[in-house]
């Protein structure tokens, strides 16, 4: 299937360019979303061009300023959060950012009524978290490593936590680990659905092995970075939660809510909090092990002002097959009966699909169900259910929005976003009002992005938020490459793959082939979305090739194809690259003496292997912070994927996996690698371990490090990258300049 | 109208066997949960067990389980009950019942049948 | 397996009186409950389901409340029609057991 068809009409060719390096750099193609800030059912905020903070009325048509860009300019603000009673608004400015979610930032109070910002008593700086109650204006507040509430914004701040130490004890905020592997978010509070309570994590870090790592800075000295980071089977952080009542927080203070037995009896983490009422509190734990998860919902006894989590509402699932969910274990969505709930896991045929929960999981009732995968349950309402699949024709790569009509028996199904804009969008996202009285579609492709409000109840369109038409206007004169998606059948595994081909293709000729791999568990690199970026480029200006596969060990095609990699990190990952390759050979227009393969992170870890595999298929390769060694990265990641690197679990392959173990193979290719000095996530120990493998096995090769630059390589360093890796590939694939 | 009408209940020797049948009208079988409920003389109503409307799922009180089958045919509108090995306290007015779906995934018995009577004795 | 206790087995009142009857679960069976009418010699009625919301056609001097493992039936200004036996039944968990049930005679 063409996803994007070739621009070029001959009358125009002469007007036509290709795609330029500069261009991907400046962002010349880059294209807009917009996903409603909605504060109602049917009232959202939106930022205007110019910079004033807009209040939209669906039902009145009706919209007006509710903060002007002049009042955001007069504190630098960046960005802004009204309060639920729109009293108040906070303005965030002096952002600084942290690691990938986490940043901290000054923050100010203006107050709508008198147009005034609060004075007396004034937020702390820096602050780490700040946000609102659900309800009212309270606001909860991290700074320092402790939880602070204010009943208002001009009160003096009731401190919640005394402990809060850097590096030591964290509240309310995750460490590095959580951050990164776990939450996903900056923050680790929620305000119970009415604000009466406060939930909070603590994390104590105390006994965890810190990296260390220079960062050098403009002084005389480099500063030295210190980082709390778990790496496999170290000590991990230890964590426990608190609720504690924000209308008299000072009477019985914080309660620690209870862990469930099994999962208390060794090492665990916390995965999730979910707020049922405002008495009633939802937690997910992970044994370290994470293969059982437990689901726990706990009450708030009022007599006794504690919380409590009967083991009649305990709910386990467990893999037998893998580690329990996909990338995380799935956070409930609970009905309108507040006990009952809706989940993603995987059904008895392997595939990820909703179940409804009531009593127990044994009991479960399923409500999709084919060989395809559920992927977001995105709102539950008195009469449906709304969620994603990649069910439609049969492509993984897909994501359509369904609903389900769950207040009449049969349930019906409904894809809402099939047949849209069937050639354009294939890829959705969606984002709902209270009470899903409207929603927004986000569509990513394959073709334009384009964004679009709709009704919740009959699903019209109501009107384009956003189509990208300067983007639109911008490619009519470029000559974008040709993609395609589409399957190779390997030993009963389906290999899904995009070709970006050159926009003059010709099967008859031979071509330089490009493998960019990420590969990682759960991951998907074969997706219906817009992309002009640096392989679009490689393919317009260049005549490259490049190929994206999804092999074992990716997600959306069901447990058999995820768990196929489980322990077993760095093996089928490549195979399957290498598969491709040569199927990819097979099809006649590949020059097999100009094959390259790149990718960052798990995706340098696998261009690694597959260019030390010893098949001869690679001419050259690139790895942009590879990961070398699985015993150097994360626990909560690592550990999920591998179990632990001891004797008796699965110390042999974390040996075996490594890639310093081939460093004699990486003697007939030509390998670039690449590496931020300060990289907090994937360590720069992981590149200078390879490096020094291979000088020690005298093998050649090139490198590159990015002084003071984290894993995303940002900025200036940017630019130097893709600079440094063109001429790399060019010079491999014998291309002038 | 809607209608369920019991038929099959009789006189039945210890460890014997016998089949009951609901024959219903007036609404869409096909999409309705269906339970057996029975009235021993002079006492309380009994769970016996249900069937969702597609058969999928059939769920029974722990102690009939091993003895008792519900089934269903939703081309006939009839709903059946398989009683296998019955003893003297398995006498009783037997009901079928018929569920309108509540949300969220559950069912009401909003309607009853007048019931029919087993008697087992030798 | 969860009981369902109900409370009181009988008790007899007057035309135009108040009566409760209340329904005790062995576990926590989260508003998950039926109450259903029988008079002699008939099948049973749904009054009540999801603890406190009333079926077609039941009149209003009927109500349901609880929550837990405690719920009650309420009958305001009992009418004649209103005798006979009656019973609750939790839909929590299968099997959906009933209470013993309680007989409302007339005084």
């Known amino acids: 299937i063409v996803l994007r068809p070739p621009r070029v009409h001959n009358s125009e060719e002469n007007t036509m360019r290709a795609l330029t390096l500069k261009d991907i750099l400046n962002g010349t193609f880059s294209y807009k979303t917009f996903f409603p800030n909605w504060i109602s059912g049917q009232e959202y905020l939106h930022q205007s061009a110019d910079n004033n903070i807009v209040l939209y009325n669906i039902e009145t048509g009706q919209s007006y300023t509710i903060l002007s860009n002049r009042t955001m300019k007069s504190v630098n603000a960046s960005n802004y959060g009204l309060s639920p009673d729109r009293q108040f608004v906070y303005l965030e400015s002096d952002y600084s950012k942290l690691w990938r979610y986490s940043y901290t930032a000054t923050y100010y109070i203006y107050d709508l009524s008198n147009g005034e910002f609060v004075r007396g008593n004034e937020l702390p700086r820096p602050i780490q978290y700040l946000c609102w109650s659900p309800v009212g204006s309270k606001l909860a507040y991290v700074y320092q490593n402790n939880i602070y509430l204010k009943q208002r914004p001009g009160d003096p701040p009731f401190q919640i936590t005394f402990n809060g130490r850097e590096n030591k004890i964290f509240n309310g905020i995750p460490d590095w680990v959580y951050e990164e592997e776990m939450l996903a978010t900056k923050y680790a509070l929620w305000w119970s659905p009415n604000g009466k309570f406060l939930a909070y994590a603590e994390f104590n870090d105390t006994d965890i092995p810190v990296i260390a790592y220079s960062y050098y800075g403009d002084e005389q000295y480099p500063r030295t970075i210190n980082i709390p980071y778990p790496k496999a089977g170290a000590k991990n952080p230890f964590v426990r939660i608190f609720i504690i009542d924000t209308t008299y927080p000072a009477y019985v203070g914080p309660q620690e809510v209870p862990v469930p037995a099994m999962i208390a009896s060794s090492d665990y983490y916390f995965s999730w909090l979910t707020w049922v009422t405002d008495e009633r509190v939802c937690l997910q734990w992970l044994k370290r092990v994470q293969n059982v998860s437990v689901l726990s919902i706990c009450d708030f006894r009022e007599d006794w002002q504690t919380w409590d989590c009967p083991k009649t509402q305990e709910h386990i699932e467990e893999s037998r097959t893998g580690w329990a969910g996909g990338f995380f274990v799935s956070t409930p969505v609970f009905s309108y009966d507040a006990i009952s709930y809706y989940k993603i896991f995987s059904d008895k045929d392997g595939y990820k699909h909703i179940h409804y929960i009531k009593d127990t999981v044994e009991n479960a009732i399923q409500i999709t169900s084919g060989k395809w995968e559920a992927i977001n349950i995105f709102r539950v309402t008195q009469d449906s259910l709304f969620y994603s699949s990649n069910e439609f024709e049969d492509y993984p790569g897909r994501r359509n929005i369904y609903r389900i009509s769950i207040g009449s028996y049969p349930p019906s199904k409904k894809c809402v976003t099939c047949h849209l804009r069937k050639e354009r969008c294939q890829y959705y996202t969606a984002s709902f009002s209270d009470y899903a009285k409207y929603y927004a579609l986000v569509c990513y492709g394959p073709g334009i992005p384009i964004s679009t409000l709709h009704d919740g109840r009959t699903d019209q369109e109501i009107k384009i938020l956003e189509e990208n038409k300067e983007l639109e206007n911008a490619l009519k004169n470029i000559q974008l490459p040709k993609e395609e998606i589409k399957k190779l059948e390997v030993d009963e595994i389906t290999l899904w793959y995009k070709m970006i081909l050159p926009p003059q293709f010709d099967r008859s000729k031979k071509y330089p082939l490009l493998i960019q791999v990420y590969g990682g568990p759960c991951s998907q690199s074969v997706r219906s979305v817009f992309a002009v970026n640096w392989i679009s480029y490689l393919a317009s200006k260049e005549g490259m090739v490049i190929a994206l596969v999804d092999g074992r060990g990716t997600a959306f095609q069901g447990d058999k194809l995820l768990y196929a990699v489980y322990r077993k990190l760095g093996v089928y990952e490549v195979e399957d690259q290498i598969t491709a390759v040569r199927k990819f050979i097979e099809m006649g227009f590949i020059d097999e003496k100009r094959i390259a393969i790149w990718g960052w992170s798990y995706g340098g870890y696998v261009s690694s292997l597959a260019l030390a595999s010893g098949t001869g298929l690679f001419k050259c390769g690139i790895a942009v912070a590879p990961v070398s060694s699985w015993e150097y990265y994360a626990s909560v990641y690592t550990e999920r994927f591998m179990g632990l690197p001891t004797k008796d679990d699965n110390l042999e392959h974390y040996k075996n996996s490594t890639v310093m173990a081939r460093a004699e193979y990486f003697r007939n290719v030509d390998y670039l690698l690449i590496h931020g000095t300060a990289d907090d996530n994937v360590h720069f120990q992981n590149s200078a371990q390879i490096a020094k493998a291979l000088v020690n096995a005298q093998v050649d090769f090139q490198a590159m490090w990015y002084s003071d630059q984290n894993h995303g390589l940002s900025g200036l360093s940017t630019n130097h990258l893709y600079t440094h890796m063109t001429h790399f590939l060019k010079q491999c694939f014998s291309l002038s300049d | 109208e809607v209608q369920l009408l019991e038929s099959g209940g009789g006189l039945v020797q210890p460890g014997g066997s016998l089949n009951l049948s609901c024959a219903a009208s007036?609404?869409?079988?096909?999409?309705?949960?269906m339970s057996w409920v029975r009235q021993a003389p002079g006492k309380g109503l009994e769970w016996i067990g249900e069937i969702n409307p597609d058969s999928s799922t059939i769920n029974y009180t722990p102690s009939l389980k091993d003895k008792f089958i519900i089934s269903r045919d939703n081309a006939k509108n009839t709903l059946y009950l398989q009683m296998n090995k019955v003893r003297s306290d398995d006498t009783a007015l037997y009901y079928c019942a018929g569920g309108y779906y509540r949300y969220p995934y559950y069912y009401t018995m909003d309607y009853w049948g007048q019931g029919t009577t087993v008697t087992v004795s030798s | 397996e969860l009981q369902m206790t109900q409370s009181p087995a009988s008790l007899s009142a007057s035309v135009g009186e108040t009566v409760t009857i209340t329904c005790r679960a062995s576990g926590n069976i989260h508003n998950y409950l039926a109450w259903y009418q029988q008079k002699q010699g008939k099948s049973p009625q749904l009054l009540v389901y999801n603890a406190k919301t009333l079926a077609d056609g039941v009149p209003s001097r009927f109500s349901g409340s609880g929550s837990g493992t405690q719920y009650s039936l309420k009958i305001n200004s009992l009418q004649p029609e209103d005798f006979g036996s009656y019973y609750c039944q939790h839909f929590w968990s299968t099997p959906y057991t009933f209470g013993g049930g309680t007989k409302l005679e007339i005084k």
């Open positions: 007036g609404f869409d079988f096909s999409t309705y949960w």
